[in-house]
C-alpha cells in the first residue's frame, strides 16, 4: 500500500504520499496575441508561451490551444497577472457624452472549462475602472487562489480587450497553476 | 532508497519524499531603506527584516545583503508586495505641454541572480503609471508566481524609486519564497 | 515511526511525512454583508460563504463567525482579494475644502487573532488612495503571503468600508488559506 509504514510494534496505513517534484505544475508567459474568433458573450482568451524562457509545464500538466489541462484531480493554486497599457482614457462627464474609443475598464478572468458541463466557470476575476488623465497609462491586475479541480478540467485566461495587453516582457503578463 | 515502501506482496520505489516542514521558506518584511550605490542600469534593491515580527527564514533559506539565497534546486513560489506612497503627481495635459519627462511610474521587479550567468533575470514585474490628482497617493503592487530555481540562485526585489517605498508597517511591504 | 524508511544496509528516521490531500485548506467567497457592530478602532470584518459554489473548507479547517480557524500549527499561505466599488471620489484641492462623504482610500487587512494574546496581529495590508474622476469606479486589492500560524489561531479579513465591497460575484472577492 502506498504510504504504508512500519515500526517495531505496529503497522499503520496512511493516505497516499507522493513526491512534491512529481506534481503537475505550469508557468506560462505572454506572447504576442493574434486576433482570433471568440464566443460572442465571452471575453477573448490569451494564448501563451509554455517552453521558452521562464515558461514550463511539467508532470503531465499540458498546455494546448490557450488551455492548461488539469491531469489529475486535487487542489490547485492558480494565478495570473496581466499588465494592460493604453492611451488616455477620459472618464469624466465629458466621456459620458460620447468617447466610445477609450477603455473605461480592464478585466481579467481565470476560467475553468469542464467538458461535461455546458457553461464555463469563472474562478477569479480582477476588474478595474480606468480613469487616467495622463497621455498614456499602464497597470497590472494580479489574481491567485486555490481551487478543487478535476482531471480533464481546462483553465484559460480571458481579458476584456486583447489589444491593451502588454506582451512585451515575460515577467509582466503570465499564468500558472500547481497542484498543492 | 528515500521513499521506498513495503507491502506484503510487492515492493515499489517512488521518487524521494520529504517532510513539508523541512522545506526552505522565508517571509521578509520591510525596514527603512538607506541610500546605497547600485548598478547604473538597474533599479535599486530593497533590504529586509528577516527575524523580527512576522519575518522568518527557515530550513537553510538564508537572507544576506538584500538577497534570499536558494539552498536547493526545485520549484518555488515567490511573492512580494511593495506599497508606494507619494505626493501629487501631475500627469494631465498641463504637464505634457511643457514637461518633456514621462509621467511618473512605480515599478517592482523580482530578480534572480545566478553567479554563473552574467545578467540578472527578471522573474516578475509589476509596473504602474501614477497620475494621481489628489494631494497625496498610496498604493500596493503585488506579485507572485512559481519558478524553477537552482541551488545557489539569489533573489532580490528592485524598485524604481526607493524614496516612495512605504516602510512604516511590516504588513504593507514584504517579500517571500517557499519550496513547493 | 512516521516517515521511517528502509534500505538494504541502513535504516534512517526522517521528519513526519503526510499526504498533501490531508492538509487543512479553505477558499471562502463573498456574500452580501449585513451591518454588524465592530470594535471602535478596528475595521469591520467580512463574513463569507464556505460551502456553496467555489467555496470549501476541508481537513479540519473550519469557518465560523467571520473567522477561519487554524486546526494545526505550521506554515500557511494566506490570501484574499476584495473588489471595491464606489461613486466619484473627488480628491483634488476641491475635496480638501469639504467633501466628507467620499472615500479617499480603500484598505484590506488580513488579521490574526490569538486567544492568548490581547491584540490582533495584522498579517497583510493592502491600502490604496482613491482619486477617481469618473462617475463611478471599481478596483480589486489582492494580498497573499506565507505565515507561521499556531493551532487555534483565527484569521479574518477586515476592510475600511463594508459598503464599498463588491459582493455580486464569488470570483471578485474571496479569502483563503492552506497549509504548506
Amino acid at each position: 500500500l502506498k504510504g504504508q509504514e512500519f515500526a517495531p510494534s505496529h503497522q499503520q496505513v496512511y493516505a497516499p504520499l507522493r513526491a512534491d517534484g512529481d506534481k503537475p505544475r505550469a508557468h506560462l508567459t505572454v506572447v504576442r496575441q493574434t486576433p482570433t474568433q471568440h464566443l460572442k458573450n465571452q471575453f477573448p482568451a490569451l494564448h501563451w508561451e509554455h517552453e521558452l524562457g521562464l515558461a514550463f509545464t511539467k508532470n503531465r500538466m499540458n498546455y494546448t490551444n490557450k488551455f492548461l489541462l488539469i491531469p489529475e484531480s486535487g487542489d490547485y493554486f492558480v494565478y495570473s497577472q496581466v499588465t494592460f497599457r493604453g492611451m488616455t482614457s477620459e472618464c469624466s462627464e465629458i466621456r459620458q457624452a460620447g468617447r466610445p474609443n477609450k477603455p473605461d475598464s480592464i478585466t481579467v478572468v481565470i476560467t475553468k472549462v469542464t467538458d461535461s458541463y455546458p457553461e464555463p466557470t469563472q474562478l477569479l476575476m480582477g476588474t478595474k475602472s480606468v480613469c487616467e488623465v495622463g497621455s498614456n497609462w499602464f497597470q497590472p491586475i494580479y489574481l491567485g487562489a486555490m481551487f478543487s479541480l478535476q482531471e480533464g478540467d481546462k483553465l484559460m485566461v480571458n481579458v476584456s480587450d486583447i489589444s491593451l495587453v502588454d506582451y512585451t516582457k515575460e515577467d509582466k503578463t503570465f499564468f500558472g497553476a500547481f497542484l498543492l | 532508497l528515500k521513499g521506498q515502501e513495503f507491502a506484503p506482496s510487492h515492493q515499489q520505489v517512488y521518487a524521494p519524499l520529504r517532510a513539508d516542514g523541512d522545506k526552505p521558506r522565508a517571509h521578509l518584511t520591510v525596514v527603512r531603506q538607506t541610500p546605497t550605490q547600485h548598478l547604473k542600469n538597474q533599479f535599486p534593491a530593497l533590504h529586509w527584516e528577516h527575524e523580527l515580527g512576522l519575518a522568518f527564514t527557515k530550513n537553510r533559506m538564508n537572507y544576506t545583503n538584500k538577497f534570499l539565497l536558494i539552498p536547493e534546486s526545485g520549484d518555488y513560489f515567490v511573492y512580494s508586495q511593495v506599497t508606494f506612497r507619494g505626493m501629487t503627481s501631475e500627469c494631465s495635459e498641463i504637464r505634457q505641454a511643457g514637461r518633456p519627462n514621462k509621467p511618473d511610474s512605480i515599478t517592482v521587479v523580482i530578480t534572480k541572480v545566478t553567479d554563473s550567468y552574467p545578467e540578472p533575470t527578471q522573474l516578475l514585474m509589476g509596473t504602474k503609471s501614477v497620475c494621481e490628482v489628489g494631494s497625496n497617493w498610496f498604493q500596493p503592487i503585488y506579485l507572485g508566481a512559481m519558478f524553477s530555481l537552482q541551488e545557489g540562485d539569489k533573489l532580490m526585489v528592485n524598485v524604481s524609486d526607493i524614496s516612495l517605498v512605504d516602510y512604516t508597517k511590516e504588513d504593507k511591504t514584504f517579500f517571500g519564497a517557499f519550496l513547493l | 515511526l512516521k516517515g521511517q524508511e528502509f534500505a538494504p544496509s541502513h535504516q534512517q528516521v526522517y521528519a513526519p511525512l503526510r499526504a498533501d490531500g490531508d492538509k487543512p485548506r479553505a477558499h471562502l467567497t463573498v456574500v452580501r454583508q449585513t451591518p454588524t457592530q465592530h470594535l471602535k478602532n478596528q475595521f469591520p470584518a467580512l463574513h463569507w460563504e464556505h460551502e456553496l459554489g467555489l467555496a470549501f473548507t476541508k481537513n479540519r479547517m473550519n469557518y465560523t463567525n467571520k473567522f477561519l480557524l487554524i486546526p494545526e500549527s505550521g506554515d500557511y499561505f494566506v490570501y484574499s482579494q476584495v473588489t471595491f466599488r464606489g461613486m466619484t471620489s473627488e480628491c483634488s484641492e476641491i475635496r480638501q475644502a469639504g467633501r466628507p462623504n467620499k472615500p479617499d482610500s480603500i484598505t484590506v487587512v488580513i488579521t490574526k487573532v490569538t486567544d492568548s494574546y490581547p491584540e490582533p496581529t495584522q498579517l497583510l495590508m493592502g491600502t490604496k488612495s482613491v482619486c477617481e474622476v469618473g462617475s463611478n469606479w471599481f478596483q480589486p486589492i489582492y494580498l497573499g503571503a506565507m505565515f507561521s500560524l499556531q493551532e487555534g489561531d483565527k484569521l479574518m479579513v477586515n476592510v475600511s468600508d463594508i459598503s464599498l465591497v463588491d459582493y455580486t460575484k464569488e470570483d471578485k472577492t474571496f479569502f483563503g488559506a492552506f497549509l504548506l
Epitope: - | P35, G86, S89, D104, S163, V165 | -
Partner: antibody, heavy 117, light 107 residues
Framework: EVQLVESGGGLVQPGGSLRLSCAAS????????MTWVRQAPGKGLEWVSG????????YYADSVKGRFTISRDNSKNTLYLQMNSLRAEDTAVYYC??????????WGQGTLVTVSS | DIQLTQSPSFLSASVGDRVTITCWAS??????LAWYQQKPGKTPKLLIY???TLQSGVPSRFSGSGSGTDFTLTISSLQPEDFATYYC?????????FGGGTKVEIK
Amino acid sequence: EVQLVESGGGLVQPGGSLRLSCAASGFTFSSYAMTWVRQAPGKGLEWVSGVSGRGGSTYYADSVKGRFTISRDNSKNTLYLQMNSLRAEDTAVYYCAYWDISSFDYWGQGTLVTVSS
Amino acid sequence: DIQLTQSPSFLSASVGDRVTITCWASQGISTYLAWYQQKPGKTPKLLIYAASTLQSGVPSRFSGSGSGTDFTLTISSLQPEDFATYYCQQFNSYPLTFGGGTKVEIK
C-alpha cells in the same frame, strides 16, 4: 557614505537670480527623491521644494511658487534650485536633503543666500 | 495647508529630567511625522521617523508617539548633549510643513 554638498549661495540684490547646486555622492542619485529646505537667520526650518527620483514630479511651497524652479541632472548626480525674483525674505541658509516618505534623512551642510541692496 | 503647533516654544530643564515636547497637527496626518534635533550652526539631525521609529544611531532615551493629530517627543533622561532645538515635520500632504520649534535650555 552619503554626501551632499551645496554651492552657489552668495549676495544678490532684490529681484535678482541665483542658482544653487547640490552635488550628491555615495548613493545612486537617480533612485531617490531630493528636496530643498531653508532656514532664515535665527528662525525655524521651512520646506522649499522637492523633486522625484527621475524628475517627473516637482513640488513647491506657496512662498516660492512661480519664482523658484527645482531640477536635477541625474547624469551629473546634481540637484539644482533656480531662484528668480529674489526678495529679502528669501535670505536664508539653503539645505539640500535626501527625502523619503517619512523624513529628510541626510542633509548637506547648507549654503547661505543673502538678498540685500 | 497643515499647520504644526509645537509646545512649548522654550523649555528649561536639568540633566536627568524627563522632557516631553508635543506637536499638534491641524488635520490628521496618520503617522507621517518626523522629529529633528538642531544645534546652533549645525544641520538638522533626524531623530524619529514615522512618528515613533527611532532613527539608527539615535540614543534610546529619545522616543516618539502619536497618530492622527497629536504627537509627542520624549527624552527620558536629559543629557548635556541634548540641549538643542527640536522640530516636528509632517509628510502627509503638500506643502510639507515644520513646527515652530522647541528650544531646550539648561536650567
